[in-house]
Interface confidence: low
Amino acid sequence: VEIYTSGALEAVNGTDVRLKCTFSSFAPVGDALTVTWNFRPRDGGREQFVFYYHMDPFRPMSGRFKDRVVWDGNPERYDVSILLWKLQFDDNGTYTCQVKNPPDVDGLVGTIRLSVVHTVPFSE
């Protein structure tokens, strides 16, 4: 499995962002496909669970991402992206996308460095 992500992303506080992750695999996509999204804050701290997919999407039932993340992928297109809603400044950090598609061997984890920025002030 080979992972493709956008690398670095900048988004405005309070908006929504699509964390895009796609993959390649010699094996057909089937029921064994699993996708795990995790988050590590920019200022350090432990890794946090964001999202899990195995045949169906599983959103977090608690924690910082509860009610703020939804599945926006299409495995048939090798797309395992998610949408993160209502961005906050403490969403700054690194998001990882891990795809397993047996019998293909596990590949590298895709990473997205998200920077949440202030709303750009309107200037005449």
Partner: antibody
Framework: EVQLKESGPGLVQPSQSLSITCTVS????????VHWVRQSPGKGLEWLGV???????DYNAAFISRLSISKDNSKSQVFFKMNSLQANDTAIYYC?????????????WGQGTSVTVSS | DIQMTQTTSSLSASLGDRVTISCRAS??????LNWYQQKPDGTVKLLIY???RLHSGVPSRFSGSGSRIDYSLTISNLEQEDFATYFC??????????FGGGTKLEIK
């Protein structure tokens, strides 16, 4: 060896429909999507639509009302049908395989079939 | 829809030259940029996908680079068979897949 081959009518009357078959070999339609792209005389490439391995389709919004794509996995054939053709639909029509990569690239193409819309 | 622009519609070069073909997207496409070669007989081949990854069987004299909205295809040590038309294509925001207008590489 991966191969795709389009077969079409060559000449179509205005207001009539166009049917093209893309026959593939070297891979299974149950594992790969197939795109349709056209190139009008002297112009660039224009994406028309795709049928995915599971049978779902995506179409270019400009053609969604008159385009349908279907397939027969067992015969390794993809079927393209466009209705209400006009002179500006004259083009070379290609089928292409959606690559096994996250970049959604079209990794193998047919040789194209030339279609002229004229009475 | 994302617009793809290849500002140079034709380019002349000699055998052995190094040439660069440019492509610009109307918005950030996150490296989801592919390059295709079309020969005069209409044959189309994928050269590079995801900005810089060489498709299998493509000679190493082809390379791709870029980020955000600006991308380029470089062919080093031009050979006779490289004289063709080159198209870029974005596959970030789908559908539709959109192509640049093409750059025709001609022999000087």
């Amino acid at each position: 060896e991966v191969q795709l081959k389009e077969s079409g009518p060559g000449l179509v009357q205005p207001s009539q429909s166009l049917s093209i078959t893309c026959t593939v070999s070297g891979f299974s339609l149950t594992r790969y999507g197939v795109h349709w792209v056209r190139q009008s005389p002297g112009k660039g490439l224009e994406w028309l639509g795709v049928i995915w391995s599971g049978g779902s389709t995506d179409y270019n919004a400009a053609f969604i009302s008159r385009l349908s794509i279907s397939k027969d996995n067992s015969k390794s054939q993809v079927f393209f049908k466009m209705n209400s053709l006009q002179a500006n639909d004259t083009a070379i029509y290609y089928c292409a395989r959606n690559g096994y990569d996250g970049g959604y690239a079209m990794d193998y193409w047919g040789q194209g079939t030339s279609v002229t819309v004229s009475s | 829809d994302i617009q793809m622009t290849q500002t140079t519609s034709s380019l002349s070069a000699s055998l052995g030259d190094r040439v660069t073909i440019s492509c610009r997207a109307s918005q950030d496409i996150s490296n989801y940029l592919n390059w295709y070669q079309q020969k005069p007989d209409g044959t189309v081949k994928l050269l590079i996908y995801y900005t810089s990854r060489l498709h299998s069987g493509v000679p190493s004299r082809f390379s791709g680079s870029g980020s955000r909205i600006d991308y380029s295809l470089t062919i080093s040590n031009l050979e006779q068979e490289d004289f063709a038309t080159y198209f870029c294509q974005q596959s970030d925001t789908l559908p539709p897949w959109t192509f640049g207008g093409g750059t025709k590489l001609e022999i000087k």
